[in-house]
Amino acid sequence: NIDVCKLGTVTVQPAPVIPLGSAANISCSLNPKQGCSHYPSSNELILLKFVNDVLVENLHGKKVHDHTGHSSTFQVTNLSLGMTLFVCKLNCSNSQKKPPVPVCGVEISVGVAPEPPQNISCVQEGENGTVACSWNSGKVTYLKTNYTLQLSGPNNLTCQKQCFSDNRQNCNRLDLGINLSPDLAESRFIVRVTAINDLGNSSSLPHTFTFLDIVIPLPPWDIRINFLNASGSRGTLQWEDEGQVVLNQLRYQPLNSTSWNMVNATNAKGKYDLRDLRPFTEYEFQISSKLHLSGGSWSNWSESLRTRTPEEEPVGILDIWYMKQDIDYDRQQISLFWKSLNPSEARGKILHYQVTLQEVTKKTTLQNTTRHTSWTRVIPRTGAWTASVSAANSKGASAPTHINIVDLCGTGLLAPHQVSAKSENMDNILVTWQPPKKADSAVREYIVEWRALQPGSITKFPPHWLRIPPDNMSALISENIKPYICYEIRVHALSESQGGCSSIRGDSKHKAPVSGPHITAITEKKERLFISWTHIPFPEQRGCILHYRIYWKERDSTAQPELCEIQYRRSQNSHPISSLQPRVTYVLWMTAVTAAGESPQGNEREFCPQGKAN
């Protein structure tokens, strides 16, 4: 703490503020009749240097002048930028025990003259906003530096405002708090910034601008859209703008989109017609404004207007497929399936589907509406039937899609050849085929149909299908394809009134099955053994089973077992073997094989044939 200088004074030459690299002389003088005793020679003046309240140096050795007992002058050099405190103390040399007494102190500030401010830029937000200018102050001066912003305009008027920088605050922006009005649109303004501190002053170059250069319009507000006659594709966007705006930029996009549609509108006066909107789509709209066609700045984008366009009647055609099952000699069950329209085709919320089944010759018609994407009816097996389905929303219905009901696998000559199914990756399968060899009518399209080979899948799950043009011989199926599951894949070739199909099994990824089949019975018939089993549970198959293997060996034998490999058929659950010796006890077991390998063995059964073996 500095005393209130009762004992003496401290002065600095040339000044308490000096440029970096300069030296200063600090003089400490005692007031008359102040000191240690009546012997002035016992008065010793010392100078202490403090930085950030920490004593860093005793300048005893820096004395350049000493008027014994009354005053001392010290030279200080190499002062760092910022403020340094010097405290003069009186040390009474005849009394070693008493600490030095503070006399007085002084702060010396070391800094630099300000550089000319640069890169001045001014802006006024909105026609009624205020002018604010910012600049680059240059190097830190380490001194209190005053900045004056001066704006000269028409009619020989100049306005100015000041701020300062020091070690607590920085001044590189000033809001003049006054507004340039549109009646000055053509006027030129000159702005300059002057910086002054104890070591010098400097001025920026003058920066010239016009009202239009610096005024950034406020973003448009109160945005709304009016759909003409409740149209889903045409709407009038409306908004409020500042009076001087001559140019607008509109941007709009569906909410899930990543790219904007951009439109420039001149003299729109807060109104613009949009004609290319997608019905029943959530859109985001934003608008920006400019006061001048060529110069000036765009406003910020307005707040978003988010709204959904109205519905329009569905377009496009439904993708229909069907299954036929004979119930008895004169009735069949027809199950129709169709895929939902995509949003750009549905153009609204689909409320229901109109389904029609019609017998072509007798003109029998069955009609119904359903909210589901499937419909099942029992109809006579006789006659030629056709089905049609259309989708309806609040504005109307799509054109009906027709399909002829034919016997899908009834014509062998239409069966595609060399059907193969290859695993492409974890979630798709590549199906390829060759066209029917001797089709007596042209193939109009192929349908690739697939469903998981799991119990009840025909009744529980609708099929998945792809329509393929007649000149394509492959399809990559991915919808609902999961790894380690075997799918039955059918390729249908359809002509106008007939169908032929070929079937194959396939999987997208496989592992060896978890377990082998369970042998349930071994029976002897006509000198042959029949092995019966239950199939491996569906989750344990882990892909398409290619073969079953039946192993056997004599009980207690260490020889390699014999085996019989059976092509996998889902419908088969028993197989004969005929190479076992009578009255020898055998151990039998089974395994299953996928493309990835063989399962562990299933249960073991012992059996001793009785009859005469071949």
Epitope: N128, T130, L176, L180
Partner: nanobody
Framework: QVQLQESGGGSVQAGGSLRLSCAVS????????MGWFRQAPGKEREFVAA???????VYPNSVKGRITISRDNAKNAVDLQMNALKPEDTAVYYC???????????????????WGQGTQVTVSS
């Protein structure tokens, strides 16, 4: 009601200084733009200086550097310091007050709502 009262006018030799003051009652000076105008005999009233509510000063180039306007919120007054006076500065000086926010408006008489009675300044050579 709002009242403005100028003081500090008088006679002075060319090159001398005067400090005019305008005391305001009824409204805080910190909330308004304050201006000084003058009218010489036989001439129109002209703008001398203004101080916006945001403390921005405005001067015509003809007086810039010789005249300083400042606000004293504690006294609810605005002062006009005039240095290096010239005979052509002789006029009646009026203080004015108004809710003005535009650059040009600060120099326009018709933008100010409240006016003082004026104080005479005479500069002799």
């Amino acid at each position: 009601q709002v009242q403005l009262q100028e003081s500090g006018g008088g006679s002075v030799q060319a090159g001398g200084s005067l400090r005019l003051s305008c005391a305001v009652s009824g409204r805080p000076v910190s909330d308004y733009a304050m201006g000084w105008f003058r009218q010489a005999p036989g001439k129109e009233r002209e703008f001398v200086a203004a101080l916006s509510a945001s403390d921005t000063t405005v001067y015509p180039n003809s007086v810039k550097g010789r005249i300083t306007i400042s606000r004293d919120n504690a006294k609810n007054a605005v002062d006009l310091q005039m240095n290096a006076l010239k005979p052509e500065d002789t006029a009646v000086y009026y203080c004015a007050m108004g809710p003005i926010g535009t650059f040009q408006g600060l120099a326009r008489q018709n933008e100010y709502h409240y006016w003082g009675q004026g104080t005479q300044v005479t500069v002799s050579s």
